[in-house]
């Protein structure tokens, strides 16, 4: 296989520190030359690379939403890390948004789990001690932890 | 979806030239490599060369340097092979590919290929 280069590789950038790769991979924090020559950093708070690799460039550094709060920022090795605010939680088969949790559990039931930034309140059946699916009741029918305030939705 | 459309491949008689081009669609990463490929009846798929879009770098494999010459058109977002001096052993299907790689020279280092284009050198 031969080389030739058609045009000359931008210089890197002060913050694009680079290094030689190893066994064709360059290091975590860092993307491969088009060549496979050189290991060029990421650029911090901008993008990041986890693993050891030969791509042609860092992945892109996650922004939190509204809604969310920043439990760590991005660094080069490491991507963003973002957490639901306090009343609100992220599901894992709808992990795109934060949604409300809701205040309180059906009639009949009762409140065995909290709301956290990964799960609703868990309510179970009094007697039986079976979970409740998750479905939002009917407000009238709705037993809140504040009396007179119905339940949020999960929207 | 990343597409990739391969054009060009026919039938040439030995010693003559041909262009194939790969125009490539829904391509979004912040650079990436476009190279070319043949399989002839039989044999293992085969690195020809690949060229880079941001810095336009170029490797050729050794079979068909100075014979065949890689290019690109970034507003057309196609690649291009000039294939000349061909031969009966150039005969092939010939696949465009798209990596995100470094010094993508193997196979195993694209992602997305096109359906590929048949040539045939024949007298």
């Known amino acids: 296989i031969t080389q030739q280069d058609l045009a000359p590789q931008q210089r890197a950038a002060p913050q694009q520190k680079r290094s030689s790769p190893s066994e064709g991979l360059c290091p975590p924090g860092h993307h491969i030359s088009e060549d496979g020559r050189d290991c060029i950093s990421c650029k911090y708070g901008q993008d990041y690379s986890t693993h050891w690799n030969d791509l042609l460039f860092c992945l892109r550094c996650t922004r939190c939403d509204s809604g969310e709060v920043e439990l760590s920022p991005c660094t080069t090795t490491r991507n963003t890390v973002c957490q639901c605010e306090e009343g609100t939680f992220r599901e894992e088969d709808s992990p795109e948004m934060c949604r409300k949790c809701r205040t309180g559990c059906p009639r009949g039931m009762v409140k065995v789990g909290d709301c956290t930034p990964w799960s609703d309140i868990e309510c179970v059946h009094k007697e039986s001690g079976t979970k409740h699916s998750g479905e939002v009741p009917a407000v009238e029918e709705t037993v809140t932890s504040s009396p007179g305030t119905p339940a949020s939705p999960c929207s | 979806e990343v597409q990739l459309l391969e054009s060009g491949g026919g039938e040439v008689q030995p010693g003559g030239s041909l262009r194939l081009s790969c125009a490539a669609s829904?391509?979004?990463?912040?650079?990436?490599?476009m190279g070319w490929f043949r399989q002839a009846p039989g044999k293992e798929r085969e690195f020809l060369a690949v060229?880079?879009?941001?810095?336009?770098?170029?490797f050729y494999a050794e079979s068909v340097k100075g014979r065949f010459t890689i290019s690109r058109d970034n507003a057309k977002n196609t690649v291009y092979l000039q294939m000349s001096s061909l031969r009966a052993e150039d005969t092939a299907v010939y696949y465009c590919?798209?990596?995100?790689?470094?010094?993508?020279?193997?196979?195993?280092?694209?992602?997305?290929w096109g359906q590929g284009t048949l040539v045939t050198v024949s007298s």
């Open positions: 590919a798209v990596t995100i790689r470094g010094a993508a020279t193997q196979t195993w280092k694209y992602d997305y």
């Open positions: 060229i880079y879009w941001s810095g336009g770098t170029v």
């Open positions: 829904g391509l979004t990463f912040p650079n990436y490599g």
